[in-house]
Interface confidence: low
């Protein structure tokens, strides 16, 4: 039908819209510092480095990890992108000055247990939520 | 006690170390383009602008919104920061080249209903999750 032909043409037009982000991601950085796609990076945090060694008894530190990388189109399945992030990448292509790319953020976080002194020098064992990055995605 | 004094001093030091981020966030940008704190920004997405007007029947577009802004220490309550984000800001202060700041991402997303033609020109009404940003936070 005419309407399905129009839709097909429309899709063919939009065909060429979205890979542009890979270019803009390249131009966002000097070639020497091109970012890879959004992913989890390993990071060990030492409580001593944070200056907390005198009130955190254990552990001495933990594998916190962090998220970093590009959220450029196409947002492949492993990027755990939300529907909104997919739409935002398209809007960014057309208005890169106005709307940023989605950002690479934790999608799964785990807790850790910490043994520490409270303000009254009591020893407390407490579970702290959302301390360890398990997975990252584009949001 | 001596240990509690040490802990107090340690906390004072870490307090001072954390406000530094306000300065570092300022120095990350030219004064003409200083970023505000992480927050929700309004954004209307027109499906025509995305080239989808011939296969999305309704709505013509929607208020998608987006998140943008700085996640610098101190991460105030309204920034909806996770424990991990708070730790990451401290690590970033000490290793800005190595670990990025947390990023400003949606914390609450809503669905919208979309009426569209599928590939066989059937009219489909479907609710799509995670399409509208309701709130943002540092992650």
């Amino acid at each position: 039908s005419a309407s399905s032909r129009r839709r097909q043409q429309s899709r063919n037009r939009s065909t060429q819209s979205q890979d542009v982000a890979r270019v803009s991601s390249a131009s966002d950085y000097n070639s020497s510092e091109l970012k890879t796609a959004c992913r989890k990076h390993e990071l060990y945090v030492s409580f001593q480095d944070l200056g907390w060694q005198d009130w955190i008894i254990a552990p001495k530190g933990y594998a916190a990890n962090y998220c970093d990388g590009e959220c450029s189109f196409p947002l492949n399945a492993h990027m755990n992108a939300t529907n909104h992030a997919i739409v935002q990448t398209l809007v960014h292509l057309m208005n890169p000055e106005y709307v940023p790319k989605p950002c690479c953020a934790p999608t799964k976080l785990n807790a850790i247990s910490v043994l520490y002194f409270d303000d009254n020098s009591n020893v407390i064992l407490k579970k702290y939520r959302n301390m360890v990055v398990r997975a990252c995605g584009c949001h | 006690s001596a240990s509690s004094r040490r802990r107090q001093q340690s906390r004072n030091r870490s307090t001072q170390s954390q406000d530094v981020a306000r300065v570092s966030s300022a120095s990350d940008y030219n004064s003409s383009e200083l970023k505000t704190a992480c927050r929700k920004h309004e954004l209307y997405v027109s499906f025509q602008d995305l080239g989808w007007q011939d296969w999305i029947i309704a709505p013509k577009g929607y208020a998608a919104n987006y998140c943008d802004g700085e996640c610098s220490f101190p991460l105030n309550a309204h920034m909806n920061a996770t424990n991990h984000a708070i730790v990451q800001t401290l690590v970033h202060l000490m290793n800005p080249e190595y670990v990025p700041k947390p990023c400003c991402a949606p914390t609450k997303l809503n669905a919208i209903s979309v009426l569209y033609f599928d590939d066989n020109s059937n009219v489909i009404l479907k609710k799509y999750r995670n399409m509208v940003v309701r709130a943002c936070g540092c992650h």
């Epitope: 939009s14 979205q18 057309m94 | -």
Partner: nanobody, 124 residues
Framework: EVQLVESGGGFVQAGGSLRLSCAAS????????MGWYRQAPGKQRELVAA???????NYADSVKGRFTISRDNAKNTLYLQMNSLKPEDTAVYYC???????????WGSGNDYWGQGTQVTVSS
């Protein structure tokens, strides 16, 4: 499925020109984005150029002013006109297409399709 076939590669002297073509077939109605990538020996694949739904274009900094991307919807073909070629442009050039469909599963972005590549060699 989408099939992509590139052509137009070859050997050229520095300063010369080539025109690459990419013919798309199959479920082309589902394609939403197309671009040209290249991969030099020992290097990562990089995007060279792409074209938006309105026909606006974007280029990698290294090819701006020298390369031009275009398309012919009637022929379902994507082109890359490469002028003032340099030895550092030597690479295998790939055509890519990306699909994003409104499906029952969501706003799908999962498929990107690739051609087999065409070799471009620029000698000094």
């Amino acid at each position: 499925e989408v099939q992509l076939v590139e052509s137009g590669g070859g050997f050229v002297q520095a300063g010369g020109s080539l025109r690459l073509s990419c013919a798309a077939s199959g479920s082309i109605f589902s394609i939403n984005a197309m671009g040209w990538y290249r991969q030099a020996p020992g290097k990562q694949r990089e995007l060279v150029a792409a074209i938006t739904s309105g026909g606006s274009t974007n280029y990698a900094d290294s090819v701006k002013g020298r390369f031009t991307i275009s398309r012919d919807n009637a022929k379902n073909t994507l082109y890359l006109q490469m002028n003032s070629l340099k030895p550092e442009d030597t690479a295998v050039y790939y055509c890519s297409a990306v699909t994003i469909l409104l499906t029952s599963g969501g706003w799908g972005s999962g498929n990107d399709y690739w051609g087999q590549g065409t070799q471009v060699t620029v000698s000094s």
